[in-house]
């Protein structure tokens, strides 16, 4: 997150981290039920660990943290390269969470966001627009949903109904490492960090997010059948 601020501790209890190796964070994720996470399809890796209830970027133990393995990763069957449509993936964890003030699921919005809606995006991604400079703690940033027209004008030929743009205040954006993390509007999960241009946070180059209102049925059906 570029030019965000430290999230309040436990204010984003649905925020998850996907880790490679001992502790290398590579993507964000969102807790949507006691045993299921959502993340971006482009975050798919064969082996990873899941950390919930953690505020710090560092591996230091925190009392609210819970660690999990992913036992099933289900990318949306329509995820495509190089267009990046349908950029979402469900992850089933090896057990259910212990519900606490640090770890709670978020409800997915059934209605699509409208232009001007204020939302919160969060993550541990780089805080510098063009270099890796990771934060000490989870970062939060208020962003505004942009019109479909403005979104398509920013990225001609690259936007479809499975995406929406938000942000566009120069110097503020999601960035590398935030992928798969939550965009929450009015208390409901509206999107996932999907993609944007380098360097991050350029004028007229807003963040592009997976438009989750288009996938409520697929998410429910997939969870029910797995």
């Amino acid at each position: 997150i570029v030019n965000g601020s430290d999230c309040q501790k436990d204010a984003q209890p649905w925020q998850g981290a996907l880790l490679l190796g001992p502790n290398k964070l590579y993507c964000g994720a969102v807790l949507i039920s006691p045993q299921w996470l959502l993340t971006a399809a482009h975050c798919r890796k064969p082996v990873f660990r899941i950390r919930l209830g953690h505020h710090s970027m560092s591996p230091v133990y925190e009392s609210g943290q819970q660690m999990f393995q992913g036992i099933k990763s289900i990318p949306h069957p329509g995820y495509s390269h190089p267009g990046h449509s349908n950029d979402l993936m469900l992850i089933k964890m090896n057990r259910k969470i212990r519900d606490s003030h640090s770890v709670k699921p978020v409800e997915i919005a059934c209605d699509c966001a409208t232009e001007g809606t204020r939302c919160m995006v969060s993550g541990w991604g780089t805080t510098s627009s063009s270099h890796n400079n990771f934060p000490k703690v989870l970062q939060c940033l208020n962003i505004t949903v942009l019109s479909e027209e403005r979104c398509k004008n920013s990225y001609p030929g690259q936007i479809d109904k499975t995406m929406f743009c938000a942000g566009d205040e120069e110097g503020r954006d999601s960035c590398q490492g935030d992928s798969g993390g939550p965009v929450v509007c009015n208390g409901k999960l509206q999107g996932l960090v999907s993609w944007g241009d380098f360097p991050c946070a350029q004028r007229n180059r807003p963040g592009v997010y997976t438009n989750l209102c288009e996938f409520v049925k697929w998410i429910k059906d997939t969870m029910n059948s797995n």
Epitope: A41, N132, G157, D197
Partner: antibody, heavy 127, light 108 residues
Framework: QLQLQESGPGLVKPSETLSLTCTVS??????????WVWIRQPPGKGLEWIGS???????YYSPSLKSRVTISVDTSKNQFSLKLSSVTAADTAVYYC???????????????????WGQGTTVTVSS | DIQMTQSPSSLSASVGDRVTITCRAS??????LNWYQQKPGKAPKLLIY???SLQSGVPSRFSGSGSGTDFTLTISSLQPEDFATYYC??????????FGGGTKVEIK
């Protein structure tokens, strides 16, 4: 300013293993989310991608060379390396190392252009 | 694998000419196309990335356009230092990363 320098033997015998190292100066190989790439160019021909390694040490190889190629990173020496086994005369080429700069973040991060190159080193395979 | 076809393979032009080189991908690559210039005995140099973005330090007479499968590199007014070989390159999510066969721009 970032600079790349290839090093290794200029002559390799057929069936042996070609080993090259790329030393990165003017910046840390592990500090930023770049790709580190090997490319070759046979005499009088075009450019051929050999493979890449990313920030997470995930490797990506050309399918035609995959069975013979290993790319690795040594962050303590600020170097990345290429090993190509069972070489033949067809592997004679100028070998370049390069930095791959991602074209975007998130899903766009897997796409990159090579913005910094070494000057290249000529490798001849001959007995 | 995605094939990249460049045309022409060579061309002769004079200083001041407008030069156009085309690159065609065998399937859509969105805007994930880069252009390089290579002079004899030298490493390639990145000119254009993401189909149309000018790499820092590259003169504005170079421009790129296109998306999907058809792309163009244009030199608006050829200069003596522009005589070189030009390559297009697509960078895929899945390997292999591939280059076009090259276009040699020679002095007429």
């Amino acid at each position: 300013q970032l600079q790349l320098q290839e090093s290794g033997p200029g002559l390799v015998k057929p069936s042996e293993t070609l080993s090259l190292t790329c030393t990165v100066s003017g910046g840390s190989i592990s500090s930023d989310d770049y790709y580190w790439v090997w490319i070759r160019q046979p005499p009088g021909k075009g450019l051929e991608w050999i493979g890449s390694i990313d920030y997470y040490a995930s490797t990506y190889y050309s399918p035609s060379l995959k069975s013979r190629v290993t790319i690795s990173v040594d962050t303590s020496k600020n170097q990345f390396s290429l090993k190509l086994s069972s070489v033949t005369a067809a592997d004679t080429a100028v070998y370049y190392c390069a930095r791959g700069r991602p074209l975007g973040y998130g899903a766009k991060h897997y796409y990159y252009g090579m913005d910094v190159w070494g000057q290249g080193t000529t490798v001849t395979v001959s007995s | 694998d995605i094939q990249m076809t460049q045309s022409p393979s060579s061309l002769s032009a004079s200083v001041g000419d407008r030069v156009t080189i085309t690159c065609r991908a065998s399937q859509s690559i969105s805007s994930y196309l880069n252009w390089y210039q290579q002079k004899p005995g030298k490493a390639p140099k990145l000119l254009i990335y993401s189909a149309s973005s000018l790499q820092s330090g590259v003169p504005s007479r170079f421009s790129g356009s296109g998306s999907g499968t058809d792309f163009t590199l244009t030199i608006s007014s050829l200069q003596p230092e522009d005589f070189a070989t030009y390559y297009c390159q697509q960078s895929p999510y899945f390997p292999p990363l591939t280059f076009g066969g090259g276009t040699k721009v020679e002095i007429k």
